[in-house]
């Protein structure tokens, strides 16, 4: 997992039954916030499953790993982590499962060392385009973020404000061109129907991209050409029917890539011929022997690697759910 972890060092706690005599004094710079557990040795603060409604103001300056999971934060305002002096050491921030539905512009400003951010399992109905860049300048100061984990952040359908969720997320990834140093991006389980074109070209440092468990039907307008550092591409559990020649050539041209394609409803008709030929020759697809046809009915469960051109003819009728361009 790419969530921040810490050693099981001794944690001090500010739970009432562990309160020390100094708790009645004015807060000290490195005191542990109420309802949190702190380990200065591990540079870790955990405020987990405490139903917090806002980020504690009195976070210790030493914190490198901050867990704020399982809370009820609702809104992350601008400068939510801005402190005097700043939290200069904070490198890993986990906000997963904290019922966030709005992340405002500049929410993560004044965190100069923030390398890993996990916002997974929050119903983000309103993610500002400038949530990660902090400003609406054409070119913002580069973000220090290297890993951005955004799995299962799609809100319920009735909270999506009648707009494209894909577009909202991509705007936040691209605005200010601040995330050019991003190496890991996880966008699994977000009901993405499509990937906006050119988005990957604007994240040139990506090593790991996880788009698994979405509803992607096609990669026709997605270019992987510039992602020369890409090492893993997870496309499992989508709605992919076939990969066309342009996509196959781009993937083959990436020097370090491993692609994961399991559990897609591959349509084994005449359009699949190029992909089958490619699969037989390529080394980039992991578990390629597990890929099977879903349609047409007569081809169901046939292994793609075992098909030949005679098997791949075109019957015009597809099930309605797959009749998309």
């Amino acid at each position: 997992s790419s969530s921040p972890t810490s050693s099981a060092s001794s944690f001090s706690s500010s739970a009432p039954f562990l309160a020390s005599a100094v708790s009645a004094q004015p807060p000290l710079p490195d005191q542990c916030p109420a309802l949190c557990e702190c380990s200065e040795a591990a540079r870790t603060v955990k405020c987990v499953n405490r139903n917090l409604t806002e980020v504690p103001t009195d976070l210790p300056a030493y914190v490198r790993n901050l867990f704020l999971t399982g809370n009820q934060l609702a809104v992350l305002p601008a400068g939510a982590f801005a402190r005097r002096p700043p939290l200069a050491e904070l490198a890993a921030l986990n906000l997963s499962g904290s019922r966030l539905d709005e992340v405002r512009a500049g929410a993560f400003e004044h965190l100069p060392s923030l390398r890993q951010l996990d916002l997974s399992h929050n119903p983000l109905a309103d993610l500002s385009p400038f949530a990660f860049s902090g400003s609406n300048a054409s070119v913002s100061a580069p973000s220090p973020l290297v890993e951005l984990i955004l799995n299962h952040i799609v809100p319920p359908e009735d909270e999506r404000q009648n707009r494209s969720f894909e577009g909202m997320v991509v705007a936040a990834l691209l605005a200010g061109r601040a995330l050019q140093g991003l190496r890991r991006l996880e966008l699994a389980s977000n009901h993405f129907l499509y990937l906006p074109r050119d988005v990957l070209a604007q994240l040139p440092s990506l090593r790991h991209l996880d788009l698994s468990n979405n509803s992607l039907v096609s990669l026709t307008y997605v270019s992987f050409r510039n992602l020369t550092h890409l090492e893993s591409l997870h496309l499992e559990d989508n709605a992919l029917k076939v990969l066309h020649n342009g996509t196959l050539a781009e993937l083959q041209g990436l020097p370090h890539i491993r692609v994961f394609l399991d559990n897609n409803p591959w349509v084994c008709d005449c359009h699949m011929a190029d992909m089958v030929t490619w699969l037989k020759e390529t080394e980039v697809v992991q578990g390629k022997d597990r890929l099977t046809c879903a349609y047409p009915e007569k081809m169901r469960n046939r292994v793609l690697l075992e098909l030949n051109s005679a098997d791949l003819d075109c019957d015009p009728i597809l099930p309605p759910s797959l009749q998309t361009s």
Epitope: S138, A171, Y221
Partner: antibody, heavy 123, light 107 residues
Framework: EVQLQQSGPELVKPGASVKISCKAS????????MNWVKQSHGKSLEWIGD????????TNNQKFKGKATLTVDKSSSTAYIELRSLTSEDSAVYFC????????????????WGQGTTLTVSS | DIQMTQSPASLSASVGETVTITCRAS??????LAWYQQKQGKSPQLLVY???SLTEGVPSRFSGSRSGTQFSLKINSLQPEDFGSYYC?????????FGGGTKLEIK
């Protein structure tokens, strides 16, 4: 004031190629996608493709793959479309049009247009 | 590709009348629809985007609306300068496609 100034009309022979230019002014050229749109005589509009001037990354409508190549010259804030293997079907007015700001993948409407370049393919 | 079906193809009306042009998308495009006006020999001009947001400088007699996958452009109290062709265009996912157009003529 935003302006898109296109090159003049072209008369070319079948099989030839042509390159049409679109010079942008009045805004930060690299911040907005530049689109190209075809309008055949008396017909509707067809989106050919767009290009991100910052990265040079182009997206073509599949229908125009192999027909149109989109490029930019950032130093002169100019976008180009090259059309090759021309036939009479390519005779049309070609427009450049400013599209979305680079980070907004859903604002793909065209708020400023060039005046259009008439291409006639005839022997 | 998403198909945009525009109707009517042509329409005659008098100055002062109210007209409505409709456009239907072949699938859900949320509110990602734009309307353009084009005069003979000129470039199209953006009137409406996001289904109902009016471009700056466009008169308030123009209005856009959405009901599911059907979109409408309404022009109240037609003025002489409103005559020309109108096109819808979805701006949801590539390739962006246009409706076939509606030619609005003076009766």
């Amino acid at each position: 004031e935003v302006q898109l100034q296109q090159s003049g009309p072209e008369l070319v022979k079948p099989g030839a190629s042509v390159k049409i230019s679109c010079k942008a002014s009045g805004y930060t050229f690299t911040d907005y996608y530049m689109n190209w749109v075809k309008q055949s005589h008396g017909k509707s509009l067809e989106w050919i493709g767009d290009i991100n001037p910052y990265s040079g990354g182009a997206t073509n409508n599949q229908k125009f793959k192999g027909k149109a190549t989109l490029t930019v010259d950032k130093s002169s804030s100019t976008a180009y479309i090259e059309l090759r293997s021309l036939t009479s079907e390519d005779s049309a007015v070609y427009f450049c049009a400013r599209g979305s700001i680079y980070y907004d993948s859903t604002a793909n409407y065209f708020d400023y247009w060039g005046q259009g370049t008439t291409l006639t393919v005839s022997s | 590709d998403i198909q945009m079906t525009q109707s009517p193809a042509s329409l005659s009306a008098s100055v002062g009348e109210t007209v409505t042009i409709t456009c239907r998308a072949s699938e859900n495009i949320y509110s990602y629809l734009a309307w353009y006006q084009q005069k003979q020999g000129k470039s199209p001009q953006l009137l409406v985007y996001n289904a109902k947001s009016l471009t700056e400088g466009v008169p308030s007699r123009f209005s856009g609306s959405r009901s599911g996958t059907q979109f409408s452009l309404k022009i109240n109290s037609l003025q002489p300068e409103d005559f020309g062709s109108y096109y819808c265009q979805h701006h949801y996912v590539t390739p962006w496609t246009f409706g076939g157009g509606t030619k609005l003529e003076i009766k």
